[in-house]
């Protein structure tokens, strides 16, 4: 504790200028005071002034009023500081002395004589109010007042409570009259060292180091730290928990980097060809006749479609072609004949039927042959009947379509769910994508089909506490604990309310 006993001398009266021994002062009593403050004694005794003592310079002669003075010699009120817990009781001895010597340091002069003394014993509480008193004896009268106040930074009934206002790393507060702390705006806690975060700042995902701040723990973002950050490698996805990559519409794959609508987004197929969202690049172009190339960007020879009939030979020209017809035929495509049935024009066992009164003919072809003279073996694949990149194969009188994985039907027109074959091992979840199935593996397994057993499964040891859910990340030795409400920490091991310096991603 620490405080000050203050004594204000107001007036001293010694009209006759007499000393305590009955002698008079010559030329007058040049008066100074000695004050002794000590612990309470029922009967005041000589001995050390346990609470302190002080002397004044000469304040006047015989009778005088003592003015207040704040500094220098002759300071009034007199200050008796103490550095202990104020007990609430005291004994005070005030002596008036005459000195023939130095005004400023009368204590040191020889021949000092006592004029009078008073003794006060009693109780006194700490407070700002002065207690006023007056003491008389036969020759003198002294008016005075006194009080006990606490030193700076000390508070309470006995000045025993230390409180120093501060605004730094160790606390942000002012002191109440009783010495208790009064936190500055934005701070809380026993020592006002905990900032009050931005209103609404998420209890688990956010924290602050100064008031009205909301700093997010790893994996969270936004003003209130209530929105997650997708995985580092994520391209076209969002998240509902940190580091997730949930694909936007039209995107697939682990990092949502496979365009499931490549045809719509990029229109890669040229020259009126048909685009399908399939194939190793995410799309396949089916060309119109006369075009080829991955994007149908290459124009074929004009003769490539075999436009000349009846054995005519085709010659490419700049923007067209020309048919050179064999004997007996004419027309742009050698489609007209000068022959009759008498010329036996039908090949491969075709039967000839006369038309236009015998001036022309028509051949009826046996199975597997075609053409106006049954000269062509039927190729049932010329019409590109197989969809979705299926391969057409001639099988005698018929043809079959050999379908790509994931397709079925006579013309490969039906899409099989890739997941129907249950390609994911060890209980993996299958997702149908245009480029094939994608497996989401359970904890402890990895690989394209969840076929690889991970030797170290981060979740296997049950690292998450308090009912938290464990997720393995993209690396087998990384895990995430998703804490239930009321818990925080990398393993959800801390109840909310502990210092918020624990992230929850292990």
């Amino acid at each position: 504790g620490s405080g000050i006993f203050q004594l204000r001398l107001q007036e001293f009266v010694n009209q006759r200028g007499m000393l305590a021994n009955g002698q008079s002062c010559e030329p007058g009593c040049r008066t100074f005071f000695r004050i002794c403050l000590k612990h309470f004694q029922a009967t005041f005794s000589e001995g050390p002034c346990t609470f302190g003592n002080v002397s004044t310079p000469v304040l006047g002669t015989n009778s005088f009023v003592v003015r207040d003075k704040n500094s220098g010699s002759g300071r009034n009120p007199l200050q008796l500081p103490f550095n202990f817990t104020w007990p609430g009781t005291f004994s005070l001895n005030i002596q008036a002395w005459h000195t023939p010597g130095d005004d400023l340091r009368p204590e040191t002069s020889p021949g000092n004589s006592l004029i009078s003394q008073i003794i006060i014993q009693g109780s006194l509480a700490v407070g700002k109010i002065w207690r006023t008193d007056e003491q008389n004896d036969t020759l003198t009268r002294l008016s005075y007042s006194y009080r006990v106040i606490c030193s700076d930074n000390y508070y309470g009934e006995s000045c025993s409570r230390l409180c120093k206002k501060r605004d730094d790393h160790f606390g942000h507060y002012e002191c109440q009259p009783d010495g208790s702390l009064s936190c500055l705006p934005g701070w809380t806690g026993k020592y006002c060292d905990q900032p009050i975060c931005l209103s609404g700042c998420h209890e688990q995902n956010g924290y602050c180091s100064k008031p009205d701040e909301c700093i997010c723990r790893p994996g969270w973002q936004g003003r209130l730290c209530n929105e997650c950050i997708p995985h580092n490698g994520c391209r076209h996805g969002t998240c509902s928990i940190p580091w997730q990559c949930a694909c936007d519409e039209g995107w697939g794959g682990l990092f949502c980097d496979q365009d499931l609508n490549y045809c719509t987004h990029h229109s890669p197929c040229k020259n009126g060809s048909t685009c399908s969202n399939s194939g190793p690049k995410g799309y396949t172009c089916t060309c119109l006749p006369g075009y080829t190339g991955e994007h149908c960007e290459l124009g074929l020879s004009k003769c490539a479609s075999n436009p000349c009939r009846n054995g005519g030979s085709c010659k490419d020209q700049e923007n067209s072609y020309h048919c050179l017809c064999p004997p007996g035929y004419y027309g742009q495509h050698c489609e007209h004949s000068t022959l009759t049935c008498a010329d036996s024009p039908c090949f491969n066992g075709g039967s000839c039927r006369e038309r236009n009164q015998g001036s022309s003919y028509a051949c009826e072809c046996p199975p597997n042959f075609t053409g106006s003279n049954c000269e062509k073996k039927v190729d049932r694949c010329t019409s590109n009947p197989c969809a979705n990149g299926g391969q057409c194969q001639n099988r005698g009188p018929s043809r079959t379509c050999r379908c790509r994985p994931g397709f079925t039907g006579t013309h490969c027109e039906l899409h099989i769910s890739d997941c129907a074959r249950s390609p994911c091992a060890h209980g993996g979840t299958c997702h149908d994508l245009e480029n094939g199935p994608v497996c989401t593996c359970p904890a402890g397994f990895s690989g394209r089909r969840c076929e690889v057993r991970i030797t170290h499964d981060a979740c296997a040891s049950g690292p998450c506490f308090n009912g938290a859910t464990c997720y393995t990340g993209l690396s087998p030795n990384n895990f995430v604990c998703n804490c239930p409400y009321g818990f925080v920490g990398s393993r959800c091991e801390f109840p909310v309310g502990l210092p918020p310096s624990f992230p929850w991603v292990a």
């Epitope: 790893p218 994996g219 973002q221 950050i229 391209r235």
Partner: antibody
Framework: EVQLVESGGGLVQPGGSLRLSCAAS????????MAWVRQAPGKGLEWVAT????????YYRDSVKGRFTISRDNAKNSLYLQMNSLRAEDTAVYYC???????????WGQGTLVTVSS | DIQMTQSPSSLSASVGDRVTITCRAS??????LAWYQQKPGKSPKLLIF???NLADGVPSRFSGSGSGTDSTLTISSLQPEDFATYFC?????????FGQGTKLEIK
């Protein structure tokens, strides 16, 4: 392919201003928080500012607070850094990066040089 | 702010060598640490995140380990293209801070 292309750097006098831009492609820009990171010549990397993807919350390193402003335009797939009251110590290559202050910076632009000198 | 101290600041090695770079944080960063590679005149490239996770497209000769305040980047068999400067970065505490860098040179 993720691409971040910065522009707007150059020579400016102390006290002057510059506006850096970053054009993003190859990912859904509006889904991701973005940042600016700088590197003084021959020195290490220093985070400058961050903006969230959701509500546009911004954070700055103490030495640029009140002078720099980070912003984004999701419709244009663009990130910006308005730099005012430039000082000699702001001289650096400024990189646009995908990430927040509490996540790794997964993708970086090629950088744009800002020189503050009289 | 958390201080990140890398060691060594530079080192010389030969193709095929095994190389280790360490990074020490001034306080626990709970595995929230990344490693970047930067070649002269180029931008940094993310190699490793969360102390030990390999970023997409990074060769498996790179690996990370550590916990608490100490982390390590290891290159199991140096290739000619690995000579560069490497930086560590913590993203556990605000603001994020980087190490001063380690320059890996050809011996």
């Amino acid at each position: 392919e993720v691409q971040l292309v910065e522009s707007g750097g150059g020579l400016v006098q102390p006290g002057g201003s510059l506006r850096l831009s970053c054009a993003a492609s190859g990912f859904t820009f509006s889904n991701f928080p973005m940042a600016w990171v700088r590197q003084a010549p021959g020195k290490g990397l220093e985070w400058v500012a961050t903006i969230s993807s959701s509500d546009g919350t911004t954070y700055y390193r103490d030495s640029v607070k009140g002078r720099f402003t980070i912003s984004r335009d999701n419709a244009k797939n663009s990130l910006y850094l308005q730099m005012n009251s430039l000082r000699a110590e702001d001289t650096a290559v400024y990189y646009c990066a995908r990430g927040y202050y509490n996540s790794p910076f997964a993708y970086w632009g090629q950088g744009t040089l800002v020189t503050v000198s009289s | 702010d958390i201080q990140m101290t890398q060691s060594p600041s530079s080192l010389s090695a030969s193709v095929g060598d095994r190389v280790t770079i360490t990074c020490r944080a001034s306080e626990d960063i709970y595995s929230n640490l990344a490693w970047y590679q930067q070649k002269p005149g180029k931008s940094p490239k993310l190699l490793i995140f969360d102390t030990n996770n390999l970023a997409d497209g990074v060769p498996s000769r790179f690996s990370g380990s550590g916990s608490g305040t100490d982390s390590t980047l290891t290159i199991s068999s140096l290739q000619p293209e690995d000579f560069a400067t490497y930086f560590c970065q913590q993203y556990n505490n605000y603001p994020p801070t980087f190490g001063q860098g380690t320059k890996l040179e050809i011996k």
